[in-house]
């Protein structure tokens, strides 16, 4: 449950967007779940996945939209401060986390072309960093009407308030557990060897463990792959190279919060895996 106690906005702006693509976009995350998306082409904050059904107050998404339009303006202003050089990608990670004592810990850091270079200092109420680019951007942002105050308000009040609201109103989403559907398949590899692939589909939360057994004994975790699905669930797979003809000695064990106990997955027969 602790991983759910954070609300983070991942903001990205590009100085030279490709035609028809946004110059600025945001994904909002409640723990490991994306609940919000925004981009400069649509200009509206929208709920994602199961959060479409959250019983929110009528003006909630208008407020998210207003705040993100302000952020969009700031981020695109930053490129003007940097001058004509580039291209640039500016990223922000803004949000808050609820500690064990229910106090809020804010986060506000920024990266330029993939390098963290600036933060927002709550005590000093200003953006900090010592790269020349950080000074140029922070100077520009300080000149925007009440920008620093708005950032403080966002981090210290709006964010924890929203997080607590979601914890109340969206508890069903946060407690969602979807067990994985599983497959264990074999395919020929280099001469004399096969690759066993254990695949887990459509599970949530994202924490999942895959491992192989050979005749009941641990045979390793293999080479893994992991990623999100468009509906908010996740997929994962792990592959292990074994001797040809030895495949039937292996099985895959999966552990996941949606399963009452670890699940043993046997190798599919060749006919079934077609």
């Amino acid at each position: 449950a602790e991983s759910h106690l954070s609300l983070l906005y991942h903001l990205t702006a590009v100085s030279s967007p490709a035609p028809g693509t946004p110059a600025f976009w945001v994904s909002g995350w409640l723990g490991p779940q994306q609940y919000l998306s925004y981009n400069s082409l649509r200009g509206e904050a929208e709920p994602c996945g199961a959060w479409v059904w959250e019983n929110q107050v009528s003006w909630y998404w208008e407020k998210e939209t207003t705040d993100l339009r302000i952020k969009e303006k700031l981020f695109l202003e930053a490129f003007k401060a940097l001058g004509g050089k580039g291209p640039y990608t500016l990223q922000g990670l803004l949000g808050c986390e609820l500690g064990p004592d229910n106090t809020s810990v804010p986060t506000a850091k920024f990266a330029l072309n993939g390098e963290e270079f600036m933060n927002f200092d709550l005590k000093q109420g200003t953006w900090g960093g010592d790269w020349p680019e950080a000074l140029a951007i922070s100077q520009r942002w300080q000149q925007q009407d009440k920008a620093a105050n708005k950032e403080l308000t966002f981090l210290l009040f709006s964010c924890p308030h929203r997080l607590r609201e979601h914890l109340e109103r969206g508890r069903g989403n946060l407690e969602w557990k979807e067990p994985p559907s599983m497959r264990l398949k074999a395919r020929p590899s280099s001469p004399g060897f096969s690759v066993l692939t254990c695949s887990a589909f459509s599970f949530y939360p994202p924490e999942l463990q895959l491992r192989f057994l050979r005749n009941g004994l641990a045979a390793g975790t293999g080479q893994g792959d992991f990623g999100p699905n468009s509906d908010g669930s996740f997929h994962a797979s792990s592959s292990l190279t074994v001797k040809s003809g030895d495949e039937h000695h292996y099985c895959c064990i999966v552990q996941h919060a949606g399963l009452a106990q670890p699940l043993r997955v046997e190798l599919e027969s060749p006919a079934k895996s077609s």
């Epitope: 072309n113 993939g114 390098e115 270079f117 200092d121 000093q124 200003t126 953006w127 900090g128 960093g129 010592d130 790269w131 020349p132 680019e133 950080a134 000074l135 140029a136 922070s138 100077q139 300080q142």
Partner: antibody, heavy 118, light 113 residues
Framework: EVKLVESGAELARPGASVKMSCKAS????????MHWVKQRPGQGLEWIGY????????NYNQKFKDKATLTADKSSSTAYMQLSSLTSEDSAVYYC???????????WGQGTSVTVSS | DIVMTQSPSSLSVSAGEKVTMSCKSS????????????LAWYQQKPGQPPKLLIY???TRESGVPDRFTGSGSGTDYTLTISSVQAEDLALYYC?????????FGGGTKLEIK
């Protein structure tokens, strides 16, 4: 030409305070962070902290948090460092240095020598 | 704090010889996202402030002779002087700009025989 000119040598009593200056010229003062570095006689370099002259934002080495106070005056393009509650450990040369690059400070002042003696 | 360790603490060479000095950090100074290293080398001659030689581990500051070369990545860095000149008599410091507090190595003193 970028120049950082620091104030003259200081002789101070233990317990006193000193305030040294670093006047910048040849560039836009508010566009670059000003760092301060300490060097005791025959010793290495120690980073004290930096100030962003445009906003007044400061970042200190915890070791110097209660010792040094960094300020900047935009109108005169001058950065200042005040050292308080001086002891013999504070006897050193103090440098101001501009961070004109992402990964280094590129220009240094000539240094201000502080001697603490009773 | 990141600890920077330089070696040797001093070395004595004849003019024209090649010199290498080492700087090791207690944690990586490499930004894996863009392969940039947050390390600089400075030269300090007696009675003078330090002077920037190399930044980003390997980029020579303008006006610095090309006999000075910086290399390395992660936690291990090297400054090489390909053919030492009499005017290279100085202390050489490395400094990390990866995270505050920015820390310096203890320095390597180069003496000319």
């Amino acid at each position: 030409e970028v120049k950082l000119v620091e104030s003259g040598a200081e002789l101070a009593r233990p317990g006193a305070s000193v305030k040294m200056s670093c006047k910048a010229s040849g560039y836009t003062f508010t566009s670059y962070a000003m760092h301060w570095v300490k060097q005791r006689p025959g010793q290495g370099l120690e980073w004290i902290g930096y100030i962003n002259p445009s906003s007044g934002y400061t970042n200190y080495n915890q070791k110097f948090k209660d010792k040094a106070t960094l300020t900047a005056d935009k109108s005169s393009s001058t950065a200042y460092m005040q050292l308080s509650s001086l002891t013999s450990e504070d006897s050193a040369v103090y440098y101001c240095a501009r961070k004109g690059l992402r990964y280094a400070v590129d220009y240094w002042g000539q240094g201000t020598s502080v001697t603490v003696s009773s | 704090d990141i600890v920077m360790t330089q070696s040797p603490s001093s070395l004595s060479v004849s003019a024209g010889e090649k010199v290498t000095m080492s700087c090791k950090s207690s944690q990586s100074l490499l930004n894996s996202g863009n392969q940039k290293n947050y390390l600089a080398w400075y030269q300090q001659k007696p009675g003078q402030p330090p002077k920037l030689l190399i930044y980003g581990a390997s980029t020579r500051e303008s006006g610095v002779p090309d006999r000075f070369t910086g290399s390395g990545s992660g936690t291990d860095y090297t400054l090489t002087i390909s053919s030492v000149q009499a005017e290279d008599l100085a202390l050489y410091y490395c400094q990390q700009h990866y995270s505050t507090p920015y820390t310096f190595g203890g320095g390597t003193k180069l003496e000319i025989k």
